[in-house]
Amino acid sequence: EQAPGTAPCSRGSSWSADLDKCMDCASCRARPHSDFCLGCAAAPPAPFRLLWP
């Protein structure tokens, strides 16, 4: 979970406990099982570039 008192992630991003930072939801297109992708499911991601695994 995000540490208490920290600012929430900006729109189009979600918190990753695995990485300890906010992650761009567009990255879920590279690795859909990343931990932060659950937090991205409710909102559409920011514009993305589709590249590799």
Epitope: D18, D24, R29, R31, W52, P53
Partner: antibody, heavy 120, light 112 residues
């Protein structure tokens, strides 16, 4: 350029442990996952597990839980895999590989492999 | 776990001729986002695996365009339009839909 350089070949006796290293360079070590893959002689590729170096969080294949322990040292940009209670079936080449979490990533990178031989 | 099954396991080829390898997954690799998480790797003799195709049909950087990938949710094909001598090695399909990361058994491509 991105490079993963693994430690040299090891010969171990049954019951011993071995620690294989994977030194990363050419990128920010904490921003990418390091996975470990086993290739037994003449066999295919088998995922062991992976680590997020920045947090130390790990994910393991059920088959290797208790056999492999993954760690990372961010001060030296080096990932480690320790294999315990070695048996003959642990004889294999072990690869580390950089995997991504990002959408703007141009390919994946593998170490050269480390041969671990378990023999009495 | 998702099981990846390849065929054939051995493929003798003639330089200049086409070749194809099949891969089947035990679960659909088509995600709700519209992307199919199927990858192809080539392991040349004595080397580490290298990525050829990502997300079923996209050519990885530096890979010759004689390679192509296609398929559906569970059935996939890697095609080489004209085999060259440097294409020998073991080809693996793999998925990136979830953990664990699993690979096919491999298809050994060798020159006739």
């Amino acid at each position: 350029q991105v490079q993963l350089v693994q430690s040299g070949a090891e010969v171990k006796k049954p019951g011993a442990s071995v620690k294989v290293s994977c030194k990363a360079s050419g990128y920010t070590f904490t921003d990418f996952i390091i996975a470990w893959v086993k290739q037994a002689p003449g066999q295919g590729l088998e995922w062991i597990g992976e680590i997020y170096p920045g947090t130390g969080r790990t994910y393991y294949s059920e088959k290797f839980r208790g056999k492999a322990t993954l760690t990372a040292d961010t001060s030296t940009s080096t990932a480690y895999m320790e294999l315990s209670s070695l048996r003959s079936e642990d004889t294999a080449v072990y690869f580390c590989a950089r995997r991504t979490i990002y959408y703007d990533y141009d390919g994946d990178y593998w170490g050269q492999g480390t041969l671990v031989t378990v023999s009495s | 776990d998702i099981v990846m099954t390849q065929s054939p396991l051995s493929l003798p080829v003639t330089p200049g001729e086409p070749a194809s390898i099949s891969c089947r997954s035990s679960k659909s690799l088509l995600h709700s986002n519209g992307i199919t998480y199927l990858y192809w790797y080539l392991q040349k003799p004595g080397q580490s695996p290298q990525l050829l195709i990502y997300q079923m049909s996209n050519l990885a950087s530096g890979v010759p365009d004689r390679f192509s990938g296609s398929g559906s949710g569970t059935d996939f094909t890697l095609k080489i339009s004209r085999v060259e001598a440097e294409d020998v090695g073991v080809y693996y399909c793999a998925h990136n839909l979830e953990l664990p990361w699993t690979f096919g058994q491999g298809t050994k491509v060798e020159i006739k």
